[in-house]
């Protein structure tokens, strides 16, 4: 029959070549001379000429060693024709199967594999997977079947079998307890991959297992006792740096310290922060300490980590004795800002108030006083008693120095410490109004027509405060009432001046007396320009000239 069973050819054949494989034979050769040929990849198409057939004999030849890893199977067609070129058979499929030889060693996909596992994990925990490939066949033979093993472990602490590798998957797992990063931070495993399922060629690689840190070490104070000296009143002052040691991985949450003041800070005077690099606890004052109130504080500070402990660990506590140092403190005016009501215009030498300071220090220090700022120069201060007296006229209406009835003075107290210290106080004198200003009309110059004159409305102002102001009263004096009338409006804050008799064009003085609600009288002369005109005028018209 015109059939050929699949032909198996081992790869890497040593020849000699050409090498006979099989003979193509058609039973039609009894009747006629048959010529044989082959087609297909490996014969007449790339890779050309690997196989050939002797035309007359039908012998199929192999011309070179085969490589299964390059081409594992060739599919050719055999042809049989008679002398005249006519096909005597249908094309026949010729399958040439290249059988595997163990001509490749396993190859790890990396020279060095890296994995990690948390310290203290239980046996059976998976660490990493390594992979080796083998180009040889692993389906029909064991040539490409890789078995993994661990050849060596460095270091061999706590013993030499800390890990195991699954022979077929390459998964490395922990096999023993006792992984302790603080003792062995990294293991180097020499791993092997052996083909023939462990009985063939071997290759090696390295698996580096990093032991990851767990928070299994508590931070410990070193030392545990501290003494510090802090000047009183200092805020944000560094009191002490507390040092801890932690065997866990530096700069990790398992190493970074968290400090807590557990006791001794009843007044909430202290705060503690962690230095980001050194991991020290920096104890500082949150508020000023008072030597006179308490000259020593004993603090208890506990340290933990940012990360929780993975097992129950005793916490470390430090004791800090803080000695408060006495400082010569400045005298403090009581109150710091003193409001005193005083009548304006009091006589010179009249006492205004006593304004004194207290010294926080316990020694009986002498305090002396002086005025630091007195813009108008109205006051004096006794250096010993703190008595403030008037040396000038206090004028509530002085707009340069008085704002909203208040005259502000700054005083200074100085102790006799070494060096001396000073404190300041603010004396706010609220000046009580006195009716020391009469009403004044505005404007004080008017222009008016002598025919059908318009009434002149003048505003009345008084620098004093109510009740020393409106309602005002008006009165014309010195015969001004012959030609003029003056009437205060209903509100009592304006005066209406009217011309009641004809006056020739000229300038006249109108004597107007205004008095306030406290009967404080003020005489004002109004300059009235009378013009020859009718009704309203602002300036007198010039003389009319005829033509």
């Amino acid at each position: 029959d015109w059939v050929v069973a699949p032909i198996s050819v081992p790869e890497n054949g040593k020849g000699p070549f050409p090498q006979r494989l099989n003979q193509l034979k058609s039973n039609k050769d009894r009747d006629t001379k048959i010529f044989y040929s082959i087609t297909g990849p490996g014969a007449d198409s790339p890779p050309e000429g690997v196989f050939a057939v002797e035309k007359e004999t039908g012998w199929l030849l192999l011309n070179k060693p085969l490589d299964r890893e390059e081409i594992a199977k060739y599919e050719l067609f055999g042809h049989a024709v008679s002398e005249n070129g006519a096909s005597v058979e249908d094309p026949m499929n010729i399958s040439i199967i290249v059988t595997d030889q163990n001509d490749h060693k396993p190859k790890f996909t990396q020279d060095t594999f890296r994995g990690s596992v948390l310290e203290g994990v239980l046996p059976g925990t998976s660490v990493m997977q390594v992979t080796a490939t083998d180009e040889d066949d692993a389906i029909y033979t064991y040539n490409g079947v890789v078995a993994y093993s661990i050849h060596s472990q460095e270091p061999k602490d706590p013993h030499d079998l800390m890990f195991t590798i699954h022979r077929s998957t390459g998964t490395i797992s922990v096999i023993s307890s006792g992984l302790d990063r603080e003792k062995v931070p990294e293991y180097t495993l020499t791993i092997q991959a052996t083909d023939m399922d462990g009985d063939g060629s071997t290759t090696t690689a390295v698996a580096v297992v990093e032991i990851l840190d767990a928070n299994d070490n508590a931070p410990m104070f070193d030392p545990q006792k501290y003494e510090a000296h802090v000047p009183e009143n200092a805020v944000g002052h560094e009191v002490q740096r507390l040092t801890v040691t932690d065997l866990d991985a530096p700069n990790s949450p398992a190493w970074r310290a968290t400090y807590l003041i557990m006791g001794g800070d009843d007044g909430d005077h202290f705060t503690i922060t962690t230095h980001p690099e050194s991991n020290q606890g920096i104890l500082t004052t949150r508020k000023g300490l008072d030597f006179e109130a308490k000259n020593q504080h004993t603090l208890y500070v506990e340290v933990t980590n940012e990360a929780p402990f993975v097992l129950k660990l005793p916490t470390s506590t430090a004791t800090i004795v803080v000695h408060v140092e006495d400082v010569n403190e400045a005298p403090v005016f009581v109150p710091p800002s003193k409001v005193v009501e005083v009548q304006e215009g009091i006589p010179t030498g009249e006492p205004v108030c006593v304004y004194t300071a207290e010294d926080p220090d316990k020694e009986n220090q002498k305090i002396s006083y002086r005025i630091l700022r007195d813009p108008a120069g109205w006051l004096a201060m006794d250096p010993d008693s703190g008595q403030v007296t008037a040396v000038g006229t206090l004028d509530r209406e002085d707009e340069q120095f008085v704002r909203n009835n208040i005259y502000e003075v700054m005083v200074l107290a100085m102790d006799n410490g070494s060096p001396p210290t000073t404190g300041t106080g603010t004396l706010l004198l609220t000046l009580i109004d006195v009716n020391d200003h009469g009403p004044v009309p505005e404007p004080r110059q008017i222009t008016i027509c002598n025919q059908s004159p318009v009434r002149q409305v003048l505003n009345i102002t008084d620098k004093d405060l109510s009740p020393h102001t409106s309602p005002f009263q008006a009165q014309l004096t010195d015969d001004s009432d012959i030609y003029w009338t003056a009437e205060v409006n209903e509100e009592g804050d304006t005066v209406v001046l009217s011309l009641k008799k004809f006056l020739k064009q000229d300038t006249y003085d109108v004597h107007l007396s205004l008095s306030d609600h406290g009967n404080k009288e003020q005489l004002t002369v109004i300059r009235a320009t009378v013009c020859d005109c009718h009704g309203h005028v602002e300036t007198c018209p010039g003389p009319w000239k005829g033509g």
């Epitope: 040593k14 020849g15 000699p16 070549f17 050409p18 006979r20 003979q23 010529f35 040929s37 050309e48 000429g49 690997v50 050939a52 057939v53 002797e54 035309k55 007359e56 004999t57 012998w59 199929l60 030849l61 011309n63 070179k64």
Partner: antibody, heavy 118, light 107 residues
Framework: EVQLLESGGGLVQPGGSLRLSCAAS????????MSWVRQAPGKGLEWVST????????YYPDSVKGRFTISRDNAKNTLYLQMNSLRAEDTAVYYC???????????WGQGTLVTVSS | DIQMTQSPSTLSASLGDRVTITCRAS??????LIWLQQKPGKAPKRLIY???SLDSGVPSRFSGSGSGTEFTLTISSLQPDDFATYYC?????????FGGGTKVEIK
């Protein structure tokens, strides 16, 4: 009838070159592997080279590798042997021979004498 | 390389004699062996291939046998045309190697 006819032999000085030819007829030359075999005067036979039917692959023993090159022109039904760096020990009758039934050496030519001498 | 040792190197025989020539391979070559006949001044001629298969046109008095490393060529009844030198060639391993030859002459 299968016929193989060698030519190109002759006298050549050591270090010289020579090209032998083998003209084939009476069979489908292009479908048979071909070889060269030599026989030193009064000595036995020695295989020199083989080439696959399509000319894609060539084979040599160590004694001639790098010096001799076998080739073929299937269109001309001719086999060649280019011999370079000739030595006195290359003196021999050179035969071309065909594979037949997939094995050596089914048919032989009459041979051509190559003499390497100064 | 595989060495092929032929014996004897010379053999004197008479017409009609049964003649046996031996070829020994230094390594196993299976049945990959041919026998060649060469007459003086002539090209060799293949007689037997695959240890025991006769080429077409070869008289049946020639036969071959053996496998592995020991091979024999037998001429059952020596004829005048059989006086020649006989060579074995192994093609089981590269390079192809010949035996040293056995000269069969008239006694």
């Amino acid at each position: 009838e299968v016929q193989l006819l060698e030519s190109g032999g002759g006298l050549v000085q050591p270090g010289g070159s020579l090209r032998l030819s083998c003209a084939a007829s009476g069979f489908t030359f292009s479908s048979y592997a071909m070889s060269w075999v030599r026989q030193a005067p009064g000595k036995g036979l020695e295989w020199v080279s083989t080439i696959s039917s399509g000319g894609h692959y060539t084979y040599y023993p160590d004694s001639v590798k790098g010096r001799f090159t076998i080739s073929r022109d299937n269109a001309k039904n001719t086999l060649y042997l280019q011999m370079n760096s000739l030595r006195a020990e290359d003196t021999a009758v050179y035969y071309c021979a065909s594979y037949y039934y997939g094995i050596p050496f089914g048919y032989w030519g009459q041979g051509t004498l190559v003499t390497v001498s100064s | 390389d595989i060495q092929m040792t032929q014996s004897p190197s010379t053999l004197s025989a008479s017409l009609g004699d049964r003649v046996t020539i031996t070829c020994r391979a230094s390594q196993d070559i299976g049945i990959n062996l041919i026998w060649l006949q060469q007459k003086p001044g002539k090209a060799p001629k293949r007689l037997i291939y695959d240890t025991s298969s006769l080429d077409s046109g070869v008289p049946s008095r020639f036969s071959g046998s053996g496998s592995g490393t020991e091979f024999t060529l037998t001429i059952s009844s020596l004829q005048p045309d059989d006086f020649a030198t006989y060579y074995c060639l192994q093609y089981g391993s590269s390079p192809l190697t010949f035996g040293g030859g056995t000269k069969v002459e008239i006694k």
